[in-house]
Structure formats: structure tokens, C-alpha cells
Amino acid sequence: QESLSCDASGVCDGRSRSFTSIPSGLTAAMKSLDLSFNKITYIGHGDLRACANLQVLILKSSRINTIEGDAFYSLGSLEHLDLSDNHLSSLSSSWFGPLSSLKYLNLMGNPYQTLGVTSLFPNLTNLQTLRIGNVETFSEIRRIDFAGLTSLNELEIKALSLRNYQSQSLKSIRDIHHLTLHLSESAFLLEIFADILSSVRYLELRDTNLARFQFSPLPVDEVSSPMKKLAFRGSVLTDESFNELLKLLRYILELSEVEFDDCTLNGLGDFNPSESDVVSELGKVETVTIRRLHIPQFYLFYDLSTVYSLLEKVKRITVENSKVFLVPCSFSQHLKSLEFLDLSENLMVEEYLKNSACKGAWPSLQTLVLSQNHLRSMQKTGEILLTLKNLTSLDISRNTFHPMPDSCQWPEKMRFLNLSSTGIRVVKTCIPQTLEVLDVSNNNLDSFSLFLPRLQELYISRNKLKTLPDASLFPVLLVMKIRENAVSTFSKDQLGSFPKLETLEAGDNHFVCSCELLSFTMETPALAQILVDWPDSYLCDSPPRLHGHRLQDARPSVLECHQ
């Protein structure tokens, strides 16, 4: 059996050491003890007695099935306790009585059915994070379960086999910053929602099949809900249940952000938000994020005209990796307040983009992200987007473009352009001179000779440049990142010719550690202020005797350098 390894500050690591019991020889000097991934099975009343100053105890995945009632009695300083993924089929309030300093408690992934016969947490007045529940056996949430807890930063409840929720069980916690609920179905959702309405600021619902969700008015008085964000992850919806979910919004008037992540819509987008008051009550929602939305019949999907009015005030929309091939012109025109639109990892092509960015589309749009779509022509893309009079930032990275032409048209206010990972070999005057930020990293560029008078930031890492670009091309450049190219040297003159350069990242290049380069780096201690990744990323490639040495440490041969 291996032993613990402890550092000078009292942090002890005993992970995966094949311990079959709590190791002996624990002392009051220990501040943190991690015994995860062992086969401990049992914690006796004297096992941790000596650890009076312990602040962190991690016992996850250690096959613990029994803990004596007074096993933690000496741990009054403990702030972090992780008992997750063990074999505890019942929980005892006597474990937690002495733990008055506890801030973090993880009991998730143990095979208990309830949280115990009496309240577990009445003494945990400092608790900030609580994780409870499991996938298969945790079946009942009762009113006594959260007694004594008044305020939590994070509460995560995995209740994927919930059979009973006692009304008002969660109501006793007056303030919860972030509540994550893993529920397999919507049976108790309305009851829970009513109980958390006045306490939760961010509600995250995971793995819930909402296909049969039906709204009914909540038994609550006029309530001012603090909820700002609502997220659905791994949920299943239908057109009908989406309409029903919308009706919940009348209770959360301060909601500003809605997120759907890895959800399935078994429908066609035939939404019909019947209640006109829903429209006005969506007024504060500014951010809608949809990632990996799976629509089995996406090819039959509706034009969403029924929800146009719902989204008129939204400022930020992300629809990522969801097979989007068209935003209908009329929809784009209704998105009057939209400032940020991210359509990354979709199926957009120029022909449909032209319809999406029609005259009057997205009139307030400032940032458009079309990364990893199916765009081919930079010239066409720029031309199509001329309708976007307020566009300042465009990301068309990770599209495979044809070689760029000599001239292109772009929205006149455009200041930021991301062309990273687009396979470009040559930059031409197609790139607009108005740019302040240009990202051409991860391409096949072996030179860069384009005059960009306003450029402040150039990102050109992971290319094939052999030298730093000429400083006269960028008279106001502040930042250049040119890592992982084939740059062999830089000199005082080169760096000095960038009058405003504040940040240069040029590590992981093929530096030839010549007398000139090494004497320059030795004579210029101020390099550390401008080279953000100095010194660890600056290694000699040649000569062979210095290969792999840091430039900072490499010493030129007196013989070579004083000939």
C-alpha cells in the first residue's frame, strides 16, 4: 500500500493509492486531504480525529458505504467536503453537525433514496455550494430536506428518478444564485417553479423531456422574481410544449437570457404564442443562445413568422451547430434590436445568406459570426453584407474560401475581420483598409505585405512567415501575435520600427540563435515587457549545440561572435 504525499503547506494527495481504509499517521498540520479513487468502504470515529485543522476533504469514488456518526466531529475548520460517487445508501445528520465552517458539500452520485430521516443541514450556516441526488434511486424531495439553508450560491439536484416532490420543499431557501435541476420529466416542474420563483437568479434545467409539459397558473401571489437566466440542456420539446413554456415567462419579468443547449425539438417550428401578453413580457430578454439543436425534421421547418414579434427586442442571438441554412429575409427585418448574431457551425452558403441579409435586415447589427459554414467566395460574402450599415465586426473563420481577389467591397464601418483557418495562401487588397483588428491565424501565408493604416491588432500565428512583417505596413500597430511560424530572428531595429507596439507574441518559432539575436536579447531586459510569452516559448532551433535552449539562457560562443 502506497503512502500519502504531502507538500509543505499541508496539501496531501492520496488519490488512487489502493487504500482500503483511511491511512494512519494523519496530523493537525494537514490542510487538505484527497483520498479519491480508493477502496476505503468505512470511515470510523477515530480515523480523522487528528485532522483538527483540515479545510478540504475529498473522498469521491472511494467505495465508502459506512461512515460512523461522529467520524467528522473534529473537523470544525472543514470548508470543502466531497463524498460524491460513493456507496452511501443513507445519509446521517450527525455527520454534518460539527461542520459549521463548511462552504462546499457534494453528496451526489450515492445510492440513497432520500436525504435522510431528519434535516441534514441545519448547522451548515456558511454553506455556499450543495450538490445532491443521483440518477437511479433518489426519488423524493421533502419539506425537511433543506431546513436551515437560507442562501446558496450553487445548488445542484440530480433527481432523474423523482417520484414525489413535497410542495414548498425548496421555498425555505430564500436566495439561490444558480440552481441546476436534473429532472427526467416535467411532472413536478410547475410545483418546483412556484417554490423557487422568488429565490433563484439562474435556473438550469437538465435532461428533461418537456414534450408533455402543460402550463397551469401558478399558486403564487404577485411576485417579483429575481430570475435573470433560464437554461435548458439536453431537453426535449415539441411545438406545443414550447408554447406552454412561454407562458411561464409572465412570472419572470426580469429574465434577460435564455439558453437551449443540446436540445431536441420534435416539431416543425409551428409555434403559436397565443397569449399576446407573452409578447410584451419577453421585453427584457436580450440574449438567446441555441447550441446543437437537433430537429429530426429540420428540412420541413417553418419560417418562424409566428415568433417574429417575440424577438424584436432581443440584442444577442447565437444559433450554433443547428443545421441553419437560412434566416428568412422577413425574419431578419424583424430583428430590429439585434446587435450580435452568431451562426457558427451551420450550413449557410452565399445564395441563402443574400436572402438573410436582405435590404433592411438586422438594422442594428454590429457583430456577425459565420464561422465554419459553407461560404466559398470572400468577394460575394462582402458584397452581400453591404446591407448591414452598422456592422463593425465580422468573423468568417473556418470557411474554405477560394483564393481572394484583388478587390472586394465590405460594410463601410467594418473594423474587425476574422479570416483564421480559411486556407488562404496570399493576402490581397480585398482586405479592407478600414480594419483595426485582423485575424489571419492558422492559414498558409508565407508573407504579409498589405498596407493597413488603421490596424491596431494583427493575429497571424500558425502560418509560414520567415520574418516579422514590415513595420511600415502598420503604423499604429499595438498588438501582434505571430507564434508558430518560421521566424528565425528579430532585431532591435525591427522591433524599434513599430512605434506603438505594446504586445508581441512570437514564441514557438524556429529561432536561429546567432550572435546578433543572442546579444540583442541579453542587452534588452525590457523584452519581457513586450514579449508576453517570454522566455519559455522562445527556444533556439539552431545551431545544433543550442537546440532546445531558451534564448534567454543560450550563450553565444566567444569564438564565433568575436571573429
Epitope: V135, L160, S161, E185, R206, D207, A211, G234, R292
Partner: nanobody
Framework: EVQLVESGGGLAQAGGSLRLSCAAS????????MGWFRQAPGKEREFVSV????????DYSTYVKGRFTIFRDNAKNTVFLEMTSLEPEDTAVYYC???????????????WGQGTPVTVSS
Amino acid sequence: EVQLVESGGGLAQAGGSLRLSCAASGRTFSRYVMGWFRQAPGKEREFVSVINRSGGSTDYSTYVKGRFTIFRDNAKNTVFLEMTSLEPEDTAVYYCAAGEYYTGDSSRYDHWGQGTPVTVSS
């Protein structure tokens, strides 16, 4: 209606590995949550693992977590259970199940395979 057929069971040494497969018929495989359960002789059927429709969420029984991995290939209508560091206590008949709900509660699964036996010898 979806039909499920498990394969890949057999005899393994303690500390060894097996990969179970569950092939589903029909074109609606990706609409189902898939679970693995097991039943040892003289014991009740118990939850092993679950995976959601996209494969983006997975969960495990505490008794197998860190040793078993569930994954699915929706293009091939198949869900897999990769079992490593096998122990004699893992000896059981392993069943694959399909349902609408992401849960470890076996009563919520509508479709079941016939099972594939796994024996782990010490």
C-alpha cells in the same frame, strides 16, 4: 417500434475488458434515450448507465463509474458499453433499454433487449 439486440457478453478475467453492443432496428433510434441495466443471479435488476439522444449527456451507477463508458453511434443505430477493470461483482446479465426519459429508473424504459451474459472470474 424499436427492437434491441445485445451482443459482446462472455467470460472475462478480473481486471479485463469487454465491449457490449446493442443494435436497434428502425429509423427512430436517435429519438430514444438509451440505458444499460444488469441483473445478477438472485438479485434485482439494477441501473448501470444512460446516454441521451445526442450522446451529449451520460451518467453511471456509482458501482461502475470510472470503469465503464457508454457511447452511441446514431448513424449505425447502436449503443455501446465499454467495460474495463472488470470485477467478479460485475457478473450479471446485461440488458439494453430504450425510452423517452433520461433516468436510471428501469420502469421508465419501454423497450428492452433479451440480455447478454457477462461472467468475470477471479
